[in-house]
């Protein structure tokens, strides 16, 4: 924007802020039971884990920050079934971790070609 | 729990994960216009800024991670009014920044003081 009217340092600070808000994988706290769609009589300790999920702003209001690639991270958690019939078991739980994000538009019917460099 | 059944290192990793998921102020991307409730003919560049907002997990499902203290951070942004009658103006915009968080019941009898100016 009309850079001549404002000092370069101020513009640099604004630009850095904008870069930091861009759509990208961000560390997020997710609830394991909701994530896995487990029944209410199965729960985990700890109930939440940290993974990366897409978030942030896009250059257009109509675009949505969405994942383009996902890996699955294995987290060691205690799985507890109620009523408690045995010692809580330490189980590996696979949770989706977004590794790539893109600002995507809504598509009415037909898919479109998305090229991710 | 039952630490005797599991090696200390595994329990330590699980505990560290749990600590990191706890309810606390987390850096978040917020859309300025939505935040300020501005009309569509006023917009900002960049449209989003980074601030801290309460997020994370609570020990009980009935609790919600909410802010208990708030400061207001001033961000230098371009405010643009449409139709554009002058050069976009560089303005200080005050955005709420959560400095304290607590796991609170969904409908507390004695509400916590949440400051949202």
């Amino acid at each position: 924007f009309a850079a001549t009217f404002y000092d370069i340092e101020t513009l640099k600070v604004i630009d850095e802020e904008w870069q930091r808000t861009q759509c990208s994988p961000r560390e997020t706290c997710v609830e394991v039971a909701s994530e896995l769609g487990k029944s209410t009589n199965t729960f985990f300790k700890p109930p939440c884990v940290n993974v990366f999920r897409c978030g942030g702003c896009c250059n257009e209001e109509s675009l949505i920050c969405m994942n383009t690639s996902t890996s699955y991270i294995s987290k060691q958690l205690f799985e507890i079934s109620v009523p408690l019939t045995s010692v809580p078991e330490l189980v590996p739980v696979k949770v989706a971790n977004h590794t790539g994000c893109k600002c995507l538009p809504t598509a009415p019917r037909h898919p479109y070609s998305i090229i991710r460099r | 729990f039952a630490a005797t059944f599991y090696d200390i290192e595994t329990l330590k990793v699980i505990d560290e994960e749990w600590q990191r998921t706890q309810c606390s102020p987390r850096e978040t991307c917020v859309e300025v216009a939505s935040e300020l409730g501005k009309s569509t003919n006023t917009f900002f560049k960049p449209p989003c800024v980074n601030v801290f907002r309460c997020g994370g997990c609570c020990n009980e499902e009935s609790l919600i991670c909410m802010n208990t203290s708030t400061s207001y951070i001033s961000k230098q942004l371009f405010e643009i009014s449409v139709p554009l009658t002058s050069v976009p103006e560089l303005v200080p915009v005050k955005v709420a920044n959560h400095t304290g968080c607590k796991c609170l019941p969904t409908a507390p009898r004695h509400p916590y003081s949440i400051i949202r100016r």
Epitope: F1, L11, N59, E60, T106, R117 | -
Partner: antibody, heavy 118, light 112 residues
Framework: QVQLVQSGAEVKQPGASVKVSCKAS????????MYWVRQAPGQGLEWMGY????????TYNQRFKGRVTMTTDTSTSTAYMKLRSLRSDDTAVYYC???????????WGRGALVTVAS | DIVMTQTPLSSPVTLGQPASISCRSS???????????LHWLQQRPGQPPRLLIY???NRFSGVPDRFSGSGAGTDFTLRISRVEAEDVGVYYC?????????FGQGTKLEIK
């Protein structure tokens, strides 16, 4: 003020490629998506796709079936559109247009006429 | 793809008189975020297009207030309260709710 300066007119043979440039000035180049739109002589507007200059992400109109490539050079604030395997019906004025946060194509280049003839 | 249909295709108008152009989309242009990304462009002879109205009813920078936009869902209208000689050209509606972005076929505004 915002300006989009496009490269000049070109005449190409069928089967060849063309690369149109669009140099932006007067705003933060990485903060806005750049659209490419073409207009055949006496016809309406056709959207080809866009590029996000911040990260190089592109979304193309399926109609161009892998013939189009959009790129940017952030060091010179320039956007490029390359169209391959040209046919006579690709004869058109090719426009670059900046898109505002609210979705309207708010600033346009003057267009680059590409004529495909043998 | 979303088909944008404009009517009329040609509109002969007397100077100083009002004019209106209709645009209908084959599907709703209401985005999942609640906004409607329907825009109007003007293309004068020999010129690139120029943004007039964005998001249904917001006039862009430097656009005279005789231009106004309205509508919702699938039906939209551009109105010119008093046509001036400089308004001659082709008017396009465009949508940026869905991909691919699409345009109406254009309405030619001419003076009687």
């Amino acid at each position: 003020q915002v300006q989009l300066v496009q490269s000049g007119a070109e005449v190409k043979q069928p089967g060849a490629s063309v690369k149109v440039s669009c140099k932006a000035s007067g705003y933060t180049f990485t903060g806005y998506n750049m659209y490419w739109v073409r207009q055949a002589p006496g016809q309406g507007l056709e959207w080809m796709g866009y590029i996000d200059p911040y990260n190089g992400d592109t979304t193309y109109n399926q109609r161009f079936k892998g013939r189009v490539t959009m790129t940017t050079d952030t060091s010179t604030s320039t956007a490029y559109m390359k169209l391959r395997s040209l046919r006579s019906d690709d004869t058109a004025v090719y426009y670059c247009a900046r898109t505002s946060y609210y979705g309207g194509m708010d600033y346009w280049g003057r267009g680059a006429l590409v004529t495909v003839a043998s | 793809d979303i088909v944008m249909t404009q009517t009329p295709l040609s509109s002969p108008v007397t100077l100083g008189q009002p004019a209106s152009i209709s645009c209908r989309s084959s599907q709703s242009l209401v985005h999942s975020n609640g906004n409607t990304y329907l825009h109007w462009l003007q293309q004068r002879p020999g010129q690139p297009p120029r943004l007039l109205i964005y998001k249904v009813s917001n006039r862009f920078s430097g656009v005279p207030d005789r231009f106004s936009g309205s509508g919702a869902g699938t039906d939209f209208t551009l109105r010119i309260s008093r046509v001036e000689a400089e308004d001659v050209g082709v008017y396009y509606c465009s949508q940026s709710t869905h991909v691919p972005r699409t345009f109406g076929q254009g309405t030619k505004l001419e003076i009687k």
